[in-house]
């Protein structure tokens, strides 16, 4: 029970085009030290959606204040959803390394499906 777990409680989220999608993720521990990243898809071809450490992600906002001490909630909200955003999103914990951080543990994934905008 003590080892870090990555919790993605929703297995599937359905959002209408144009709306925002909230993808929930939390860690059960602050250890090991290292950033969280969100990806769409798995494997070598996965797409980086958000990097806690660096980068500019204009459509992504964090649900809670990530700089807050002892924060364990790494949920994100993606604005203005389009059908192209459909896919499975993974919240991934990295362990701080040198020179590169190392992937430590991934959440089970949340499948985002996009409904047509209500007329």
């Amino acid at each position: 029970e003590d080892e870090l777990q990555v919790i993605q409680p929703e297995k599937s989220v359905s959002v209408a085009a144009g709306e925002s999608a909230t993808l929930r993720c939390a860690m059960t521990s602050l250890i090991p030290v290292g950033p969280i990243m969100w990806f769409r898809g798995a494997g070598a071809g996965r797409e980086l959606i958000y990097n806690q450490k660096e980068g500019h992600f204009p459509r992504v906002t964090t649900v809670s204040e990530l700089t807050k001490r002892n924060n364990l909630d790494f949920s994100i909200s993606i604005s203005n959803i389009t059908p192209a955003d459909a896919g499975t999103y993974y919240c991934v914990k990295f362990r701080k390394g040198s020179p590169d951080d190392v992937e430590f543990k991934s959440g089970a994934g949340t499948e985002l499906s996009v409904r047509a905008k209500p007329s």
Epitope: I7, Q8, K11, T28
Partner: antibody, heavy 121, light 112 residues
Framework: QVQLVQSGAEVKKPGSSVKVSCKAS????????ISWVRQAPGQGLEWMGG????????NYAQKFQGRVTITADESTSTAYMELSSLRSEDTAVYYC??????????????WGQGTLVTVSS | DIVMTQSPLSLPVTPGEPASISCRSS???????????LDWYLQKPGQSPQLLIY???NRASGVPDRFSGSGSGTDFTLKISRVEAEDVGVYYC?????????FGGGTKVEIK
């Protein structure tokens, strides 16, 4: 051994509110989902909403949105369900149930004993 | 919301005989990770519900092996290979793929 112990039966007047508690022992409270499920007399099971304390915020079924508030106090490992604007149709047994974390996070593997709420004038 | 439909509503059974309950969902419960997010519960008379089967086909701890779950996507089945007197009660399927979680209407199993 995980146990969920709920508060006792309540009799309430229409229009009032009720707050039911569910104290958990065993396991790590913060990373488990606590759901609230109700059962009207002779009827089936109905999921009202749930909370994973580590996230702080709850999810609610549309039917109860605006009338139910689910909270969790990590310091006492207790979850609460408050239902307002009570009407006679809210007479039911209210259960709390705990789910596992990770890939089965909303699985209801442990249940409280149930709390009977009777709404009557 | 995902709608869960169970059949039959009532199932009279003879001890020692098999029994089968069907559950259908209004949309697929098969996730890209290969799991079906469908659970089965039994509520014995006067008791809280108890978990029988999770993720479509996995028996919960302490559940006798006469209970089995099968199916994928939108069609699921709970089978009891040989019904015992203690198996009477109401059986519910429930989907946990999407919030809100939704239950089937229940199937009442009673001894003939």
């Amino acid at each position: 051994q995980v146990q969920l112990v709920q508060s006792g039966a309540e009799v309430k007047k229409p229009g009032s509110s009720v707050k039911v508690s569910c104290k958990a022992s065993g396991g790590t409270f913060s990373s488990y989902a606590i759901s609230w499920v109700r059962q009207a007399p002779g009827q089936g099971l109905e999921w009202m909403g749930g909370i994973i304390p580590i996230f702080g915020t709850a999810n609610y079924a549309q039917k109860f949105q605006g009338r139910v508030t689910i909270t969790a106090d990590e310091s006492t490992s207790t979850a609460y369900m408050e239902l307002s604007s009570l009407r006679s149709e809210d007479t039911a047994v209210y259960y709390c149930a705990r789910g596992r974390p990770q890939s089965e996070s909303y699985l209801l593997d442990y249940w409280g004993q149930g709390t009977l709420v009777t709404v009557s004038s | 919301d995902i709608v869960m439909t169970q059949s039959p509503l009532s199932l009279p059974v003879t001890p020692g005989e098999p029994a089968s309950i069907s559950c259908r969902s209004s949309q697929s419960l098969l996730h890209s990770n290969g799991y079906n997010y469908l659970d089965w519960y039994l509520q014995k008379p006067g008791q809280s519900p108890q978990l029988l089967i999770y993720l479509g086909s996995n028996r919960a701890s302490g559940v006798p092996d006469r209970f089995s779950g099968s199916g994928s996507g939108t069609d699921f089945t709970l089978k009891i290979s040989r019904v015992e007197a203690e198996d009477v009660g109401v059986y519910y399927c429930m989907q946990t793929l999407q919030v809100p979680l939704t239950f089937g209407g229940g199937t009442k199993v009673e001894i003939k």
